[in-house]
Interface confidence: low
Amino acid sequence: EAHKSEIAHRYNDLGEQHFKGLVLIAFSQYLQKCSYDEHAKLVQEVTDFAKTCVADESAANCDKSLHTLFGDKLCAIPNLRENYGELADCCTKQEPERNECFLQHKDDNPSLPPFERPEAEAMCTSFKENPTTFMGHYLHEVARRHPYFYAPELLYYAEQYNEILTQCCAEADKESCLTPKLDGVKEKALVSSVRQRMKCSSMQKFGERAFKAWAVARLSQTFPNADFAEITKLATDLTKVNKECCHGDLLECADDRAELAKYMCENQATISSKLQTCCDKPLLKKAHCLSEVEHDTMPADLPAIAADFVEDQEVCKNYAEAKDVFLGTFLYEYSRRHPDYSVSLLLRLAKKYEATLEKCCAEANPPACYGTVLAEFQPLVEEPKNLVKTNCDLYEKLGEYGFQNAILVRYTQKAPQVSTPTLVEAARNLGRVGTKCCTLPEDQRLPCVEDYLSAILNRVCLLHEKTPVSEHVTKCCSGSLVERRPCFSALTVDETYVPKEFKAETFTFHSDICTLPEKEKQIKKQTALAELVKHKPKATAEQLKTVMDDFAQFLDTCCKAADKDTCFSTEGPNLVTRCKDALA
């Protein structure tokens, strides 16, 4: 229904706290360089204005669209051109072009320092002094580094953060209480960020239809007892919610997500028997819980998929009459029978089925032509299954750090032109798939591995788009989203690459490495490893292992030495010489 004042409507629906949080996220995601104080001031102004509209919907400007109101606020910021360059040109446009322009200027890799966590005592002090400001800083810092973070979900993580601080700041040993809990939230939030970015990429590059197909497959796996009409309704609603969030319409997105959660909880009987625990929770926890609810038990009496989609005499007629609906029912039926497949795989199978019908329904004897389609799925299914087995075996053998290094070597050989920091970030993220997925039960491994890898590779593509340097990467990133992972997996050593010349300074280290946290030490070593591969792309695994072992030994020796500086300056050059010899 239409409301006289959109901003009053959203304020009333969401309540002041969520309204302010979402406006702060929106501003932080659009203008990523502004300070918290600058954004907090704007948020307060918008909130005060919203309250005047709640009191009187006919008040001046209350009838304006949210894009107009928010855009006008952003464009009124002083020194916009000095700080943001051509983004300031967006302010010369009218809505909706102005908002589109802002969206195009979102930076997936802003040049901001890493978000450092203060030490426990300091954190607890500032949290106790002003919890609202503390959480505002959290929303601001995360949102500007992750401009497509799913806004209602970011409110959920802020709530988690709040609960952890409330609990741990009351304890004697704050540090040991906070660290593991906040690390857990950070890890989950980072995964949430890359997953959501993938959804927005799907929406931006391939439109709502592509996202809806993803949603149908995912929902059918989770709710195999829901009928096709119910799944379609949920997929349509979920597509709307994600479209809004990806498009910067965060108030609408959060409001519609709350409505969807309410609908699911009121219609459990036609959706799933697993929802009650989620539905007992307050709003943010409820929506989060529903988004990762366990799969319902599959109906015991599902007929073979072939009956309706291969053996039925009317296949081509049904397909011709309503292509999208027929393919949708195929995707639904196949997905509800296969919670053990990744969504990417299910979409590849649906695509293969569609291509088969397109070809066969034009022939003289269609049934003879499409009769073998299910058998033709086999290689498509085997490929990711083998990928999971090979990689999980390797992870179990090497552990997370060793597995990351193996991936780093592999990907540097596939795309040596890509910058070393990007390769290291990608390999570290890809390597986490082992810890995340390989410990799961067999039937959950494939969906976990492939859908996580797809999300990480989407980030590789986004970063590469900014500065395209590798034809291999461009080729894989240009195709459809579901084909990306198989494309990257199939890449081999880039034969066109001219190896980097050996530069001693790249492999020269100083005693400051000894005091770095373990994670930073690993990144330094992995940076050196990528550089070694760029120097010798065809180095054997054995050669690289020799060099890395020598390197680790060197660090260990010098970091334990009484005079570290002398050790680094004398042993360092010897290490460089040995490396060159080992790789010769």
């Epitope: 909880c265 459990q268 009987a269 028997s273 929802l275 009650q276 539905c279």
Partner: nanobody
Framework: EVQLVESGGGLVQAGGSLRLSCAAS????????MSWVRQVPGKGPEWVSA????????RYAESIKGRFIISRDNAKKTLYLQMNSLKPEDTAVYYC????????GSQGTQVTVSS
Amino acid sequence: EVQLVESGGGLVQAGGSLRLSCAASGFTFGSFGMSWVRQVPGKGPEWVSAIDSGGTDTRYAESIKGRFIISRDNAKKTLYLQMNSLKPEDTAVYYCTIGQSTSRGSQGTQVTVSS
């Protein structure tokens, strides 16, 4: 189609008893927790009691604790509410709902307690 049909309501003296039934169809009754909710005209719905899918875990609102008993028969796909020591303030339309929700998907049954 999901259907919930309540019965057993009526007019009763304060201190008296009633047994409400809710016959369910169109879904796997034995897989879902169920609740009783009541509503007085002009007021919002009030959650009364809930029972888990197996019938082992029951929960009650403070206002009716010790007087009402919720139970279920999964074979018969029926939910029950045994109401004892009824008070005038228990007067309302009683609905059964799926899960612990206060949303109403049924007609309800009127319970009137006179003093």
